[in-house]
């Protein structure tokens, strides 16, 4: 059988500074069993950008309903997007673990850059 | 439709064992998580045990003593059970899990369940 | 671990009558609740996801409801098939899934 992969289909997203920025995820498997995490940034000092377990994030919504069932869809979208938020994304799928989860695989990245708004 | 179907049930002896299987149909096995839970006679429910892909969960109650496996060419679940004890007397089912909140699992699918019984 | 409260044991009505009972979780699990059905001899039939979302092919009668640590399944006008037992089911941390201990519902 297939492994599962983290498919990050846009290598690269333009914003204007106050809209939303839409960063597309789908995984290809709903197994091995865990959650998925949104981060800017890799290694030890990346941000959690968004976590539907644990955490508030108050700009950031969820494409896809949460109680779908059997969703394969990670995408998110960022409110009132500044500057400040440019940088990599990266969904990343982790496998459930007693008692923290293990990270399993990350998909390729994100790059959202900011356009200043025209004054 | 989907359908689950345990066997392998029966009476035993304590420090005995006995192997369970679930044979699935009606859906895409290998893409699911798939469960035991059992039922003690007259009691309420308890999970036993849950697998993934390679990745296996245990109640504490049986750590060490079950080992939860999957052939996908078979759509088979088993559930291989090592130096029972009378309190693992019950019926237990074989379920399929489904996913909600990008996490989180519930079972939307349920076997019929094979009794196990551990006496003396 | 999460433990899961049913309360009453057991729930005496007459059919076509109106039953509300209640699942207390010692922690927050959010929405991450499942109720389950079981009438004798049967294996559980999934209910309700979600605390509040009906599976395919549940009657309208029943619903769910609450969030956090509180949740109640209600069944409006009982049918003689709704008299079982329910179990309520949290899945937002585990291992393990934990369970209630279960609500009979019996005919008054």
């Known amino acids: 059988e297939e492994e599962l992969q983290v498919i990050q289909p846009d290598k690269s997203v333009l914003v204007a500074a106050g809209e939303t920025a839409t960063l597309r995820c789908t995984a290809t498997s709903l197994i091995p069993v865990g959650p998925i995490q949104w981060f800017r940034g890799a290694g030890p000092g990346r941000e959690l950008i968004y976590n539907q377990k644990e955490g508030h994030f108050p700009r950031v919504t969820t494409v896809s309903d949460l109680t779908k069932r059997n969703n394969m869809d990670f995408s998110i979208r960022i409110g009132a997007i500044t500057p400040a938020d440019a940088g990599t994304y990266y969904c990343v799928k982790f496998r459930k673990g007693s008692p923290d989860d293990v990270e399993f695989k990350s998909g390729a990245g994100t790059e959202l850059s900011v356009r200043a708004k025209p004054s | 439709d989907v359908q689950l179907l345990e066997s392998g049930g029966g009476v035993v002896q304590p420090g005995g064992s006995l192997r369970l299987s679930c044979a699935a149909s009606?859906?895409?096995?290998?893409?699911?998580?798939m469960t035991w839970v059992r039922q003690a006679p007259g009691e309420g429910l308890e999970w036993v045990s849950t697998i993934g892909s390679g990745d296996t969960y245990y109640a504490d109650s049986v750590k060490g003593r079950f080992t939860i496996s999957r052939d996908n060419s078979k759509n088979t679940l088993y559930l291989q059970m090592n130096s029972l004890r009378a309190e693992d007397t019950a019926v237990y089912y074989c379920?399929?899990?489904?996913?909600?909140?990008?996490?989180?699992?519930?079972?939307?699918?349920w076997g019929l369940g094979t009794l196990v019984t551990v006496s003396s | 671990e999460i433990v899961l409260t049913q309360s009453p044991a057991t729930l005496s009505v007459s059919p076509g009558e109106r039953a509300t009972f209640s699942c207390r979780a010692s922690?927050?699990?959010?929405?991450?609740l499942a109720w389950y059905q079981q009438r004798p001899g049967q294996a559980p039939r999934l209910l309700i996801y979600?605390?509040?979302i009906r599976e395919t092919g549940i009657p309208e009668r029943f619903s769910g409801s609450g969030s956090g640590t509180e949740f109640t399944l209600t069944i409006t006008s009982l049918q003689s098939e709704d008299f079982a037992v329910y179990y309520c089911q949290q899945y937002y941390d585990w291992p393990p899934f934990t369970f209630g201990g279960g609500t009979k519902v019996e005919i008054k």
């Open positions: 379920a399929k899990d489904s996913t909600v909140s990008w996490s989180g699992d519930f079972f939307d699918y």
């Open positions: 922690q927050n699990v959010k929405n991450d």
């Open positions: 009606g859906f895409s096995f290998s893409n699911f998580a």
């Open positions: 979600a605390a509040r």
